[in-house]
């Protein structure tokens, strides 16, 4: 409709690391003579319309979301209705709606994508002694406390992908962070290096682990 307040948010999701603070940007264009007494601002969870934070009747009504949200009071009069979300958790991921009512009303939704980097993988071998070429071994690559679910890739020392006989499991802990365990069953050659890459698809962050088997004894590369 002509003259309706235009509410603007980023098109791309806001990416926030677990434990950090995130800013969900939202803005509107105040008309000349605008005062905060005219503003009614509601932040809510898009899906449920559950209240997150509000500014009504000329004042900040505070957080309705575990006391982890705040507005930018000094910037509201200029049309900055952004929301600060503190100590981001996995459970915060989703869509938030910024609803602005002045003379008329408008809304827009912004997505929050939560992420956490995966730890450097630890590598274990079973069996881990008296290995001979032709033996079948199980190599386990474990990486912890990442989000969202990882992509796991295996390759040999020549960089050739190893896709057969791989079993990957991912389990979420109480905080919603994932622990990844990927198991490669392989028949040993005379010697070889086996690498596991754990990729966080949101952060585009790769965590590498490798094990080298050179006859006897077997060696693990030093931790980076």
């Amino acid at each position: 409709p002509t003259g309706a307040v235009e509410v603007q948010v980023p098109e791309d999701p806001v990416v926030a690391l677990v434990g950090t603070d995130a800013t969900l940007r939202c803005s509107f264009s105040p008309e000349p003579g605008f005062s905060l007494a005219q503003l009614n601002l509601i932040w809510q969870l898009t899906d449920t319309k559950q209240l997150v934070h509000s500014f009504t009747e000329g004042r900040d009504q505070g957080s309705a979301y575990a006391n982890r949200t705040a507005l930018f009071p000094d910037l509201l009069a200029q049309g900055n209705a952004s929301l600060r979300l503190q100590r981001v958790r996995v459970a915060d991921e989703g869509s938030f709606t910024c609803f602005v009512s002045i003379r008329d009303f408008g809304s827009a939704a912004v997505s929050l994508q939560v992420a956490a980097p995966y730890s450097k993988p630890s590598m274990t071998l079973e069996p881990n002694k008296d290995l001979r070429p032709g033996d079948t071994v199980t190599i386990t690559c474990s990486s912890y406390r990442g989000y969202p679910e990882a992509e796991v890739f295996w390759q040999d020392g020549q960089g050739v992908p190893l896709t057969g006989n791989v079993t990957t499991s991912q389990m979420a802990n109480e905080q919603g962070l994932f622990d990844v365990h990927s198991v490669l069953r392989v028949v040993l050659g005379a010697n070889g290096t086996y690498s596991c890459l754990v990729r966080n698809p949101v952060l585009q962050q790769d965590a590498h682990g490798s094990v080298t088997i050179t006859g006897q004894p077997m060696t693990f590369p030093p931790e980076a």
């Epitope: 409709p1 309706a4 307040v5 509410v7 009614n40 509601i42 809510q44 898009t46 899906d47 449920t48 319309k49 559950q50 209240l51 009504t56 869509s95 709606t97 609803f99 009512s101 002045i102 003379r103 008329d104 009303f105 408008g106 809304s107 827009a108 939704a109």
Partner: antibody, heavy 124, light 109 residues
């Protein structure tokens, strides 16, 4: 249980105006958006505009801009829709329907409560 | 102008399952469109069945469910009853206004 009760049927002359009321009873959800929706004979539903009585702010569909005025009186829990410069094709049943701006229950039921409708006939 | 497309009519049998859809000219329907489904029977006021894409309004029977399928809003009726014969309208929210679809006439044979 919230109910929306609308004013009675109206017969109007072309060029005149009509004002329809919609009173909420049995408890209110605040803030709510009171929408006005019409249905001409044999036609579908058409959104005309809506108001948030708590804030006193209204929006209108482009088609009705300048011809419709939606107001509300918070003290009486009543919303009003006034349509001016009436034409014969404004003959329709006019409904009010409540939508939650904030779902206090944590569940968004949408336009869950409707008025019984007000028939407006425009005829010379 | 935003255009919304619904199947003009559908026919089903008692006890069957039927899915009505609602397509938007602006692209994929998302949760921020708060898809609503409204039932209208002759001589009666419309009745809100589903709000917020998939939330049943109080009094809506469990056989009605809302969802998003392939970028469209959808209403599925599982175990259709004779009393479900009606016109069903979808409504989508676009930032500051509602837009209604043209309606689907559901016939039960």
């Amino acid at each position: 249980q919230v109910q929306l009760v609308q004013s009675g049927a109206e017969v109007k002359k072309p060029g005149s105006s009509v004002k329809v009321s919609c009173k909420a009873s049995g408890g209110t959800v605040r803030p709510a958006l009171i929408n006005w929706v019409r249905q001409a004979p044999g036609q579908g539903l058409e959104w005309m505009g809506g108001i948030i009585p708590l804030f006193g702010t209204a929006n209108y569909a482009q088609k009705f801009q300048g011809r419709v005025t939606i107001t509300a009186d918070e003290s009486t829990s009543t919303a009003y829709m006034e349509l001016s410069s009436l034409r014969s094709d404004d003959t329709a049943v006019y409904y009010c329907a409540r939508d939650q701006v904030v779902a206090t229950s944590g569940v968004n039921f949408g336009m869950d409560v409707w008025g019984q409708g007000t028939t407006v006939t425009v005829s010379s | 102008d935003i255009q919304m497309t619904q199947e003009p009519s559908l026919t089903t049998s008692p006890g069957g399952t039927v899915t009505l859809t609602c397509r938007s000219s602006t692209g994929a329907v998302t949760t921020s469109n708060y898809a609503n489904w409204v039932q209208e029977k002759p001589g009666q006021a419309p009745r809100g069945l589903i709000g917020g894409t998939n939330k049943r309004a109080p009094g809506t029977p469990a056989r009605f469910s809302g969802s998003l399928i392939g970028g469209k809003a959808a209403l599925t009726i599982t175990g259709v009853q004779p009393e479900d014969e009606a016109i069903y309208f979808c409504a989508l929210w676009y930032s500051n206004l509602w837009v209604f679809g043209g309606g689907t006439k559901l016939e039960i044979k």
